[in-house]
């Protein structure tokens, strides 16, 4: 039975040319995290594998940085980065947990960030 829940940074906004941290946190389960995938729509951005470490997809290597933690940092944002992002936690024995974040990249310099949470 899957008892865990994923907390995310929710709906967030950022300024064009800036950077943003996408963060998910899996709680309420003792399941072992074997891998975390970060995806944008149907595109794989990055993988953090327990054995291998971080792999950033080649097409995003210039603008995506691993971390902090299991999160992902997007840099040099453009309006085309607006959209849904998913953190996919592969765990044992629970299976797969998915969290959703919506990022809006704004032209203006008054980008207001949505509610953020801090991971201890």
């Amino acid at each position: 039975m899957m008892t865990g829940t994923i907390e995310t940074t929710g709906n967030i906004s950022a300024e064009k040319g800036g950077s943003i941290i996408l963060q998910c946190h899996l709680s309420s389960t003792t399941a072992q995290v074997t891998q975390v995938n970060w995806e944008q729509q149907d595109q794989l951005l990055a993988i953090c594998n327990a054995d291998l470490g971080w792999h950033i997809s080649p097409s995003f290597k210039d603008r995506v940085a691993p971390g902090p933690g299991l999160g992902l940092t997007l840099q040099s944002l453009t309006v085309n980065d607006t959209g849904e992002y998913f953190c996919i936690y592969h765990t044992y024995p629970d299976g797969t947990y998915t969290g959703r974040i919506f990022l809006e990249v704004l032209e203006s310099s008054v980008a207001e960030h949505g509610a953020r949470f801090q991971i201890p």
Partner: antibody, heavy 124, light 108 residues
Framework: EVQLLESGGGLVQPGGSLRLSCAAS????????MSWVRQAPGKGLEWVSS????????YYADSVKGRFTISRDNSKNTLYLQMNSLRAEDTAVYYC?????????????????WGQGTLVTVSS | EIVMTQSPATLSVSPGERATLSCRAS??????LAWYQQKPGQAPRLLIY???TRATGIPARFSGSGSGTEFTLTISSLQSEDFAVYYC??????????FGGGTKVEIK
């Protein structure tokens, strides 16, 4: 710390059989794929066989298909390679290796963690 | 079966120099390529996977490049502990998963 310890190697006559074991510790064994890779003396590496975490999928190199059987006992955290109809060309150090992928995340068939190897010598 | 060919078979390099090792696949393997280092009497050590991603704990002097059929492992400044045999391996989604014949990097 991930540890893989092979055993069961030794000298066997052509046509004979051996069963290799690989005892795993330091990680949750059951979700991870496992593989056997061998290396003949003074030669390169050769992939032999792989098995999924559940044991439901197995793969073999053509050179051992029909003669070798890979299996696992998740309750004992142990991987096996049953080798029958052994030939001189099967002489090698046999390594077990942990796949970084699981049934959930998908398999890669690349290996960060290896055992120290066990030598199988097939000779009359 | 995809055949992996490494060149040169032996590479003589002085400590501190750059070493460039090549690996060619008989058909495209996309970026499904790994590099291993092996020293005598030891198990192989994973260096690079996905053609260019360093595995955890691998020094930055090791870098991989290429895709499709042509791949390169570069060691930017050889240290004494880098003298070893290096293998490439393809892991396209379906077996068999094949290794190259190896390149021995020796002290010049």
């Amino acid at each position: 710390e991930v540890q893989l310890l092979e055993s069961g190697g030794g000298l066997v006559q052509p046509g004979g059989s051996l069963r290799l074991s690989c005892a795993a510790s330091g990680f949750t064994f059951s979700p991870y794929g496992m593989s056997w890779v061998r290396q003949a003396p003074g030669k390169g590496l050769e992939w032999v066989s792989s098995i999924s975490g559940s044991g439901g999928r197995t793969y073999y190199a053509d050179s051992v298909k029909g003669r070798f059987t890979i299996s696992r006992d998740n309750s004992k955290n142990t991987l096996y390679l049953q080798m029958n109809s052994l030939r001189a060309e099967d002489t090698a150090v046999y390594y077990c290796a942990k796949d970084p992928g699981t049934d959930s995340s998908g398999y890669y068939y690349i290996w960060r963690y290896w055992g120290q190897g066990t030598l199988v010598t097939v000779s009359s | 079966e995809i055949v992996m060919t490494q060149s040169p078979a032996t590479l003589s390099v002085s400590p501190g120099e750059r070493a460039t090792l090549s690996c060619r696949a008989s058909q495209s393997v996309s970026s499904n390529l790994a590099w291993y280092q092996q020293k005598p009497g030891q198990a192989p050590r994973l260096l690079i996977y996905s053609a260019s991603t360093r595995a955890t704990g691998i020094p930055a002097r090791f870098s991989g490049s290429g895709s499709g059929t042509e791949f390169t492992l570069t060691i930017s400044s050889l240290q004494s502990e880098d003298f070893a045999v290096y293998y490439c391996q393809q892991y396209v989604p379906h077996p068999p998963f094949t290794f190259g014949g190896g390149t021995k990097v020796e002290i010049k």
